[in-house]
């Protein structure tokens, strides 16, 4: 079940996710000047076995010179602003995804790809955040959120992040120990069925991260 | 809730254009598809041409010559460009929404639609 929505956004913040569950999908989509080949797959889809996931199909571009399909609207500065935080990260992968079953790596880029990738999560996806460089974290629980299914419907849960404005750039997962705040997750979960997966493995997984993968972007 | 309203249908005669919109509101589209069908009378809904957040087109090989699909993200807005128009372009024009990747959504997969614009060509 693809999640609804992308993950929620944070002041201040980027959001990474260290795996891929199985399912999701992920944009064929080109820099501007070029486009999907004709022939070519329209989205990469994370698939695989009880042993291995790996992405399915290949991104390509292709000069778009004889018809203009990849026009661009020049995004407006606050519009940049709201995009920041899911600007394409840097594809490396620190992680050993053996660790992680059920779940593919980052996709290396491919020729002429878009600056920014669009994902398409599904219920049970995790994502990480992390201040930006220049704001500093403060913790009132995990920072985090899980796309969950409830009552039929999908959600992101709210990562319990503030990054305030002071010149120091925490490390990630967050350094800075958590404020005091007894009632962990504000959301309150009703009798209704709950579908998350993954929640331990990928929380011990993430305390192993390096702050790198949210420091690079394509240029 | 998510409301689609198109609008720029009308009666044109054949080899002319036209240009239709639709305005989308309700919740954010950045991870969903904007998509145009058509529907003739006694005839399926057809998928004719889709458009992601970052203008990654798709179009249906009947109008790829002809249509061309954009998109206006801060307006919330996607066009559908009908050039050279022929009377067997005569349909109800639907704009679509559908999460994912641009890909051809079947019509009864489709997530939202609009109530429909009519474009009739005459010869």
């Known amino acids: 079940e693809l999640c609804d929505d992308d993950p929620p956004e944070i002041p201040h913040a980027t959001f990474k996710a260290m795996a891929y569950k199985e399912g999701t999908m992920l944009n064929c989509e080109c820099k501007r000047g070029f486009r999907r080949i004709k022939s070519g797959s329209l989205y990469m889809l994370c698939t695989g076995n009880s042993s291995h996931s790996s992405w399915d199909n290949q991104c390509q571009c292709t000069s778009s010179a004889t018809r203009n399909t990849t026009k661009q609207v020049t995004p407006q500065p606050e519009e940049q602003k709201e995009r920041k935080t899911t600007e394409m990260q840097s594809p490396m992968q620190p992680v050993d995804q053996a660790s992680l079953p059920g779940h593919c790596r980052e996709p290396p880029p491919w020729e002429n790809e878009a600056t920014e990738r669009i994902y398409h999560f599904v219920v049970g996806q995790m994502v990480y955040y992390q201040c930006v460089q220049g704001y500093r974290a403060l913790h009132r629980g995990p920072a985090e959120s899980v796309c969950k299914m409830t009552h039929g419907k999908t959600r992101w849960t709210q990562p319990q992040l503030i990054c305030t404005g002071e010149m120091e750039t925490s490390q990630f997962p967050g350094e800075e120990k958590p404020q005091a705040s007894p009632e962990g997750r504000p959301e309150s979960e009703t009798s209704c069925l709950v579908t998350t997966t993954d929640f331990q493995i990928q929380t011990e997984m993430a305390a192993t991260m390096e702050t790198s993968i949210f420091t690079t972007e394509y240029q | 809730e998510v409301q689609l309203v198109e609008s720029g249908g009308g009666l044109v005669q054949a080899g002319d254009s036209l240009r239709l919109s639709c305005a989308a509101s309700g919740r954010s589209f950045r991870n969903y598809i904007l998509a145009w069908y058509r529907q003739a009378p006694g005839k399926e809904r057809e998928f004719l041409a889709a458009i992601s957040w970052l203008d990654g087109t798709l179009y249906a090989d009947s109008v790829e010559d002809r249509f061309t699909i954009s998109r206006d993200n801060p307006k919330n807005t996607v066009h559908l460009q009908m050039d050279n128009l022929k009377p067997e372009d005569t349909a109800v024009y639907y704009c679509?929404?559908?999460?994912?990747?641009?890909?051809?959504?079947?019509?009864?997969?489709?997530?939202?639609w609009g109530q429909g614009t009519q474009v009739s060509v005459s010869s």
């Open positions: 679509a929404a559908d999460r994912g990747p641009v890909r051809p959504v079947l019509a009864p997969d489709v997530d939202y």
